[in-house]
């Protein structure tokens, strides 16, 4: 059983790790299927976890063209690691009013990854801010 602060620290580590995974995939953008994918941007408050799940559901795929296939597939799979439902559910009070994944603008892999990174950075910033202000609801 993790203490609350330990759990929060691990949560932050996981979120930062996702940014590193996105950065790694950006190195291999030419080895990804050039498909257009829903890429949330300027996500409204309280819809961050909904947008996060849209990024995770997107069919980012290796083009299977070369020697980087293994690291790409491993990285994509790690990007789809599901956070515990308490993280997403507890914080997503207004998730029923959030846009559907299909309603977001579709972008090629490079922009998709940039927008995913931007959302992750925003979520980390919010999490740190809420901790600073002593709020549970990060």
């Amino acid at each position: 059983h993790k203490s609350s602060s330990q759990g929060q620290d691990r949560h932050m580590i996981r979120m930062r790790q996702l940014i590193d995974i996105v950065d790694q995939l950006k190195n291999y953008v030419n080895d990804l299927v050039p498909e257009f994918l829903p890429a949330p941007e300027d996500v409204e408050t309280n819809c961050e976890w909904s947008a996060f799940s849209c990024f995770q559901k997107a069919q980012l795929k290796s083009a299977n063209t070369g020697n980087n296939e293994r690291i790409i597939n491993v990285s994509i799979k790690k990007l789809k690691r599901k956070p515990p439902s308490t993280n997403a559910g507890r914080r997503q009070k207004h998730r029923l009013t959030c846009p559907s994944c299909d309603s977001y603008e579709k972008k090629p892999p490079k922009e998709f990854l940039e927008r995913f990174k931007s959302l992750l950075q925003k979520m980390i910033h919010q999490h740190l801010s809420s901790r600073t202000h002593g709020s549970e609801d990060s």
């Epitope: 993790k2 330990q6 759990g7 691990r10 949560h11 580590i13 996981r14 790790q17 590193d20 995974i21 950065d23 790694q24 190195n27 980087n68 293994r70 690291i71 597939n73 491993v74 990285s75 799979k77 790690k78 690691r81 599901k82 956070p83 515990p84 993280n87």
Partner: antibody, heavy 126, light 106 residues
Framework: QVQLVESGGGVVQPGRSLRLSCAAS????????MHWVRQAPGKGLEWVAF????????YYADSVKGRFTISRDNSKNTLYLQMNSLRAEDTAVYYC???????????????????WGQGTTVTVSS | EIVLTQSPGTLSLSPGERATLSCRAS???????LAWYQQKPGQAPRLLIY???SRASGIPDRFSGSGSGTDFTLTISRLEPEDFAVYYC???????FGQGTKVEIK
């Protein structure tokens, strides 16, 4: 304590088969991906294969693809490496290693192989 | 496939000296994906550094890692007798190892 113990090594003729096992203890085996890594006599480390924590994905080095199969039995906390069509160049010490990135969101998060067995020796010779 | 090139092949130093080991990647590597291992004769490798600069559990603070992109460094600030061994860098995800650097007693 956290431990990995390999077994199944030995001397085998070229073209024959061998199955290695790796018994895990001291941690939740089903939460971790697992690797096989080998080291030929006097040489460096060579990654051989990886299996996802739930067995859903497997990856192999080009040198063993089509000949070796990695598998796991989470109910027995055991990792396996089935080696077919063995060649002289497969002669090595074979290590199993735990992938340090747990499937648990709040678990270990190391991008590296953080626990290793002591190794089992495979010699392919006629 | 990415290639990791370690240099020098062998480093001859005395206890108490500083050791600097290099690992160069043929393509850019995200820092999270770079690990270092130590292997002593007759023993299994041991994870020293993950994420390019984070020490694994139980690793003394004389070991440090740095670098980004294609150039990474493992530094042993003051060599102890037990540090003489072979060191490998590795890219996580492709799990490619460098060829190793042997740190031997001068």
């Amino acid at each position: 304590q956290v431990q990995l113990v390999e077994s199944g090594g030995g001397v085998v003729q070229p073209g024959r088969s061998l199955r290695l096992s790796c018994a895990a203890s001291g941690f939740t085996f089903s939460s971790y991906g697992m690797h096989w890594v080998r080291q030929a006599p006097g040489k460096g480390l060579e990654w051989v294969a990886f299996i996802w924590y739930d067995g859903s994905d497997k990856y192999y080095a080009d040198s063993v693809k089509g000949r070796f199969t990695i598998s796991r039995d989470n109910s027995k906390n055991t990792l396996y490496l089935q080696m077919n069509s063995l060649r002289a160049e497969d002669t090595a010490v074979y290590y199993c290693a735990r992938d340090g990135d747990s499937s648990d969101w709040y678990g270990d998060y190391y991008f590296g192989m953080d626990v290793w067995g002591q190794g089992t020796t495979v010699t392919v010779s006629s | 496939e990415i290639v990791l090139t370690q240099s020098p092949g062998t480093l001859s130093l005395s206890p108490g000296e500083r050791a600097t080991l290099s690992c160069r990647a043929s393509q850019s590597v995200s820092s999270s994906y770079l690990a270092w291992y130590q292997q002593k004769p007759g023993q299994a490798p041991r994870l020293l550094i993950y994420g390019a600069s984070s020490r694994a559990s139980g690793i003394p603070d004389r070991f440090s890692g740095s670098g980004s992109g294609t150039d990474f460094t493992l530094t042993i600030s003051r060599l102890e007798p037990e540090d003489f061994a072979v060191y490998y860098c590795q890219q996580y995800g492709s799990w490619t190892f460098g060829q190793g650097t042997k740190v031997e007693i001068k």
